[in-house]
């Protein structure tokens, strides 16, 4: 580390005076201190000489001696005050920039430490501090106020108590930058636009920022719109607007409207389309089939896009049957507003009944007129069978009557044995009815098939059983010829709350 | 909801001294200035000091300087004002006020205690 | 220390009709854009509310017919429509520098 003589931290001398500073070091040797005149350098090898021989008060500040070789970087420094009676101060710089929330020194060095006691800083024109100004005092320094804000960006001065009077420094002006974290923040509204030609509209494009230094500008299809601009300061944020107004609207109005706005930190920007159409319109739409089959007891949502401009003024979900006048409670539809001009409508229909298959009709209204989308609902139900035995054309016949949606497929079985079902390794054969006869088919209802099964003699110890199944489940019947009536064994189970 | 709440109403012989407190709940305590206020029905609201919560750091009205001594306690949220050798003319209304510690510069007092009456009678 | 000068003194206003009420300061209250006034209510036997904040801000909760303007030395409070509620006294107070001031106050009173 290299050494100051004299070996003092402070040396207090008055104007005129003349000053050596002699550092040593094991290597050559530099030294740093305040920009000021008559001071003359002299080297040699592995010291240095710093001397004056007429002392001022801008001689005042500290010198440090530094060896450049040195890795560890080691310095020493010596604080001079050349006290001036008429001169206190010694103002190093005359502006001082930081960022906010920084702490920004005020470099005015005391030139006599005796008058630190009665020392303070005020903004000029003898204006008090600002409130909570933060700020502290060292002699060898100057002011430092803590955490600097934008608005003490100020004009400010240094005082010292000398002889019971106050004497200031020059000026030295603060400025305090805010911290920009990034482009200007952007809103365009509306985010979408649709006129009738002839209408009026307006788009809105504006950006905000903690300091006033940006620009924006409104562009339509990439050509920039001349729009006078208003300016705010608000909450803390400067913000300007651009209000493009359109008394009638026609269709050279209508593309793509940039919002843009740009400041040091770089670029945003915000876009929106604004259309122009002939006349109202209204368009319903579904990302569902509008044909849906649901299982008895399940639920179902009816979904419904709607594009329509103007707004609509009214809308409905109606049930057209074929089971009952029975219409949708109110509390099962919702809407929802996906923008402006785009709405969803959902009827909620949970755990269905039989008597609520049928057509369900959206039906929406506009000043462009009424429209309509209409879901068809079937309900998918799991096959109940029924076998009788009967003579056709004076043979025996066993007769299977299957109702179900979507149509049951039958198949025949006879096993040994009397048994509620034929398990496989009972079976003594198997039929399959391909084209079982339809009986009934009507929309929305189930679909009834028969099956015959001529059989020459019943077996007596043998059972005969009736299958049926389609896409929900599967159902059968069992007839025992011995007794005194066949033996059902119902549908699969199946349950559902009414 | 933000409360401050103030001690209740003081009768005080002249040259007495009277402490009154101010308990804040539902805020940060730290993160705003306490601020005192004087209303007398003839000289309107007068701003007596401040004290930061964090570091007990004080500013005083040069009026109030020797009258009035501000204090915190951070562990019970509440600060209080001393105020001294008493006089018909403090006979007043005292309110706490909070003062937001912020990037904002404003310093507006957001929120006041209820007030605490002060008498000063022989 | 800055003075702050309210008038009217008092005032009355008719039920739904603006009144205004002015402040100004001995000293500018304004630094880069930023105007260090605000607007307190006080009804009696209640404590001050802040209503305005920053001369033209609206504090949280406080209904839009109230608002505020100006800058440097001179400033004002709108209230319109006025409401039956609105009977209170209406102070300003500085906060640029110590200490914070307040104006003597006006007492506003609904016809």
């Known amino acids: 580390i290299p050494v100051i003589e004299p070996s003092v931290p402070e040396l207090v001398v008055k104007p005129g005076a003349t000053v050596t500073l002699r550092c040593v070091g094991n290597g050559s040797v530099e030294w740093d201190g305040p920009p000021s005149p008559h001071w003359t350098l002299y080297s040699d090898g592995s010291s240095s000489i710093l001397s004056t021989n007429n002392a001022t008060f801008q001689n005042t500040g500290t010198y440090r001696c530094t060896e450049p070789g040195d890795p560890l970087g080691g310095s020493a420094a010596i604080h001079l005050y050349v006290k001036d009676p008429a001169r206190p101060w010694n103002v190093l710089a005359q502006e001082v920039v930081v960022f906010e929330d920084q702490d920004a020194l005020l470099p005015c060095l005391l030139t006599d430490p005796v008058l630190e006691a009665g020392v303070s800083l005020v903004r000029v024109r003898g204006r008090p501090l600002m409130r909570h100004t933060n700020y502290s005092f060292s002699p060898w320094h100057g002011f430092t106020i803590h955490r600097a804000k934008f608005i003490q960006s100020q004009d400010y001065q240094c005082s010292a108590l000398m002889g019971g009077r106050k004497v200031m420094s020059i000026s030295i002006r603060l400025k305090v930058q805010k911290v920009i974290p990034g482009p200007p923040a952007l809103t365009l509204v509306p985010a979408e636009l649709v006129r009738i030609r002839g209408e009026a509209a307006q788009i809105v494009c504006s950006a905000s920022s903690v300091d006033v230094n940006f620009d924006v500008f409104l562009q339509h299809n990439n050509t920039k719109l001349a729009i006078p601009q208003q300016s705010d300061f608000h909450n803390n944020r400067y913000q300007k607007v651009l209000t493009l107004n359109l008394d009638q609207v026609d269709f050279q109005h209508a593309g793509n409207y940039s919002c843009v706005a740009s400041n040091v930190q770089g670029k945003h920007s915000t876009s929106m389309f604004f259309r122009v159409v002939e006349s109202a319109y209204l368009n319903l739409s579904s990302e569902q089939n509008l044909i849906q089959e649901v299982t008895v007891g399940e639920g179902l949502n009816l979904k419904v896009m709607v594009e329509a401009y103007p707004g609509l003024q009214g809308f409905n979900w109606t049930y057209l049957g074929p089971f009952s006048d029975h219409q949708p409670e109110p509390k099962l539809a919702n809407a929802t507003t996906k923008d402006t001009y785009r709405h969803t409508f959902t009827l909620s229909l949970p755990r269905l009944k039989p008597s609520e298959a049928g057509r369900y009709s959206f039906l929406a209204r506009n000043p462009g007129g009424w429209r309509a989308l209409t879901f068809e609902l079937t309900l998918r139900y799991p096959p109940e069978v029924s076998v009788i035995w009967t003579f056709i054309n004076g043979s025996g016949t066993l007769l299977c009557a299957a109702s179900g949606y979507p149509q049951p497929n039958v198949t025949w079985l006879q096993c040994s044995g009397h048994t509620d079902r034929c398990d496989e390794a009972q079976v003594l054969q198997v039929w399959d009815d391909p084209y079982p006869e339809v009986l009934s088919q009507e929309p929305f209802h189930k679909v009834t098939v028969q099956s015959l099964l001529t059989v020459e003699t019943l077996e007596h110890n043998q059972t005969y059983e009736c299958r049926a199944h389609n896409s929900v489940g599967s159902g059968s019947w069992a007839f025992i010829p011995i007794s005194a009536g066949a033996h059902t064994h119902p549908p699969d189970e199946f349950l559902f709350t009414p | 909801e933000v409360q401050l709440q103030q001690s209740g109403p003081e009768l005080v012989k002249p040259g007495a001294s009277v402490k009154i407190s101010c308990k804040a709940s539902?805020?940060?305590?730290?993160?705003?200035?306490m601020n005192w206020v004087k209303q007398s029905p003839g000289k309107g609201l007068e701003w007596i000091g401040d004290?930061?919560?964090?570091?007990?750091?004080?500013t005083y009205n040069q009026k109030f300087k020797g009258k009035a001594t501000l204090t915190v306690d951070k562990s019970s949220t509440t600060a209080y004002m001393e105020l001294r050798s008493l006089t018909s003319e403090d006979s007043a209304v005292y309110y706490c006020?909070?003062?937001?510690?912020?990037?904002?510069?404003?310093?507006?007092?957001?929120?006041w205690g209820q007030g605490t009456s002060v008498t000063v009678s022989s | 220390d800055i003075v702050l000068t309210q008038s009217p003194a008092s005032l009355a206003v008719s039920l739904g009709q603006r009144a205004t009420i002015s402040c100004r300061a001995s000293e500018s209250v304004s630094s880069h854009d930023i105007h260090l006034m605000h607007w307190y209510q006080q009804k009696p036997g209640q404590s001050p509310k802040l209503l305005i904040y920053a001369a033209s801000n609206l504090e949280s909760g406080v209904p839009a017919r109230f608002s505020g303007s100006g800058s440097a030395t001179d400033f004002t409070l709108n209230i319109h429509p006025v409401e039956e509620e609105d009977a209170a006294t209406y102070f300003c107070?500085?906060?640029?520098?110590?200490?914070?001031?307040f104006g003597g106050g006006t007492k506003l009173e609904i016809k």
């Open positions: 107070q500085q906060s640029i520098e110590d200490p914070p001031t």
């Open positions: 004290i930061n919560p964090n570091n007990g750091g004080t």
């Open positions: 539902a805020i940060t305590f730290t993160d705003y200035y």
């Open positions: 006020a909070r003062e937001k510690i912020s990037m904002e510069y404003y310093y507006a007092m957001d929120y």
